[in-house]
Interface confidence: medium
């Protein structure tokens, strides 16, 4: 960052999107600012308009191509600059040499579905979205189940230390409404972080058969 009160954080979704957040203490809300991306190995550059997301932070998405196109590799360096208009000129507010595969945050898993549900267990599957083929199987997942009367924050995390796009939830209560979420993270990258949580999948366990213990 150009000065100590500025914070500029970006993540690559591993395919064709770099999402950035810039925060600056004391910056004017109505200032027009952009993120400029200049890859060192590519014959393109890209710009996105920073839009306010809070009192002192702005965000934008650099769309590098079609969602599943592989636009960057592990040896690309993208110089990212925050440029803000000052009168008729542009002033550089922040800069970073962005290494895409060191700063990964994948898209949230999609297509969650109940494969099979019983009284005490439920098998759920999902798919990863817009994830690079470079990862092969080097991904991990976290999942959580929302039980009645609890919050998501209270839900214990289940970790899948391999690329496993399904889970069998055990020891559930019969005839009970649950919600399920999953997120994904590549093993690669010093500053890589978890994807957002998936949209919750609601399901209900089957009622216990009459005359049987629960």
């Amino acid at each position: 960052a150009v000065n100590g009160t500025s914070r500029f954080t970006c993540f690559y979704n591993s395919r064709a999107n770099i999402s950035c957040v810039w925060s600056q203490d004391g910056a004017l809300q109505d200032t027009s600012c952009q993120v400029h991306a200049w890859p060192d190995r590519r014959r393109w550059n890209q710009t996105c308009e920073l839009l306010p997301v809070s009192q002192a932070s702005w965000a934008c998405n650099l769309i590098l191509g079609t969602p599943d196109s592989q636009k960057l590799t592990a040896v690309d360096i993208v110089t990212l600059r925050v440029m803000c208009r000052e009168g008729v000129r542009w002033r550089m507010m922040a800069i970073q040499d962005f290494k895409p595969f060191e700063n990964l945050r994948l898209m949230a898993p999609i297509s969650l579905q109940v494969v099979h549900v019983e009284t005490h267990r439920c098998n759920i599957s999902w798919k990863i979205s817009q994830a690079s083929h470079y990862f092969e199987r080097h991904l991990e997942f976290e999942a959580r189940t929302l039980s009645p009367g609890h919050t998501w924050e209270e839900a214990p995390l289940m970790t899948l230390k391999q690329k496993q796009e399904w889970i069998c939830l055990e020891t559930l209560t019969p005839d009970t409404q649950y919600e399920f979420q999953v997120r994904v993270k590549p093993l690669q990258g010093e500053f890589t972080t978890w994807s957002p949580w998936s949209q919750p999948l609601a399901f209900r366990t089957k009622p216990a058969a009459l005359g049987k213990d629960t």
Epitope: W38, P39, D40, R41, R42, R43, T73, A74, V75, I77, T79, L80, I95, Q96, D97
Partner: antibody
Framework: EVQLLESGGGLVQPGGSLRLSCAAS????????VHWIRQAPGKGLEWLGA???????QYNAAVKGRFTISRDNSKNTLYLQMNSLRAEDTAVYYC?????????????WGQGTLVTVSS | DIQMTQSPSSLSASVGDRVTITCQAS?????LYWYQQRPGKAPRLLIY???NLASGVPSRFSGSGSGTSYTFTISSLQPEDIATYYC?????????FGQGTKVEIK
């Protein structure tokens, strides 16, 4: 016209230090990555590291910790600081810049400066 | 690190001959470059991105290949082509070069 001019080479004793300079003209060092490459006498080329346009650096593990790349934007000059020099560091040292995109390879080279490490 | 192995390490050919140099990578690479280095001079870029001719380079030079196997060709050797030729990968860091192929005139 893009030009790179290395200087600072010479004779240094083992264990000593030396700072090489690479004066750039025809472009701004804040807009392009610049690399250091060396060639031992009668040998092939070895990539040492680079400083990117935003100022961050990348090194070959073979020299990381002993060699440091830096730059002075106001002088449009790059530096290679070499410490704890060994006989095997004897080489011609080049700075190089890719074309407008690195896909274009090392399109621009300096003339090289000779470093001799010997007692 | 990716090892780049050139063959032959040296060759002698007559003016007008077709000369071929191969470069084998220890693992698959996507971006390959070829340089010419005359004695006492800095390297000069000839081929970028596997097969593209650098600015001002004569069309007798060409490159091809993919994956781990690449080829550099001089279609008709000229006296000024006496030099050492290097391949280089830019698919992963550290960047690495082949050991060089010295080309001489018979």
């Amino acid at each position: 016209e893009v030009q790179l001019l290395e200087s600072g080479g010479g004779l240094v004793q083992p264990g000593g230090s030396l700072r090489l300079s690479c004066a750039a003209s025809g472009f701004s060092v804040t807009s392009y990555g610049v690399h250091w490459i060396r060639q031992a006498p009668g040998k092939g080329l070895e990539w040492l590291g680079a400083i990117w346009s935003g100022g961050s650096t990348q090194y070959n593990a073979a020299v990381k910790g002993r060699f440091t790349i830096s730059r002075d934007n106001s002088k449009n000059t790059l530096y290679l600081q070499m410490n704890s020099l060994r006989a095997e560091d004897t080489a011609v040292y080049y700075c190089a810049r890719a074309g407008d995109y690195n896909y274009d390879g090392f399109a621009y080279w300096g003339q090289g400066t000779l470093v001799t490490v010997s007692s | 690190d990716i090892q780049m192995t050139q063959s032959p390490s040296s060759l002698s050919a007559s003016v007008g001959d077709r000369v071929t140099i191969t470069c084998q990578a220890s693992q698959s690479v996507s971006f390959l470059y070829w340089y010419q280095q005359r004695p006492g001079k800095a390297p000069r870029l000839l081929i970028y991105d596997t097969s593209n001719l650098a600015s001002g380079v004569p069309s007798r030079f060409s490159g091809s290949g993919s994956g781990t196997s690449y080829t550099f060709t001089i279609s008709s050797l000229q006296p000024e082509d006496i030099a050492t030729y290097y391949c280089q990968q830019w698919s992963t860091y550290p960047l690495t070069f082949g050991q060089g192929t010295k080309v001489e005139i018979k």
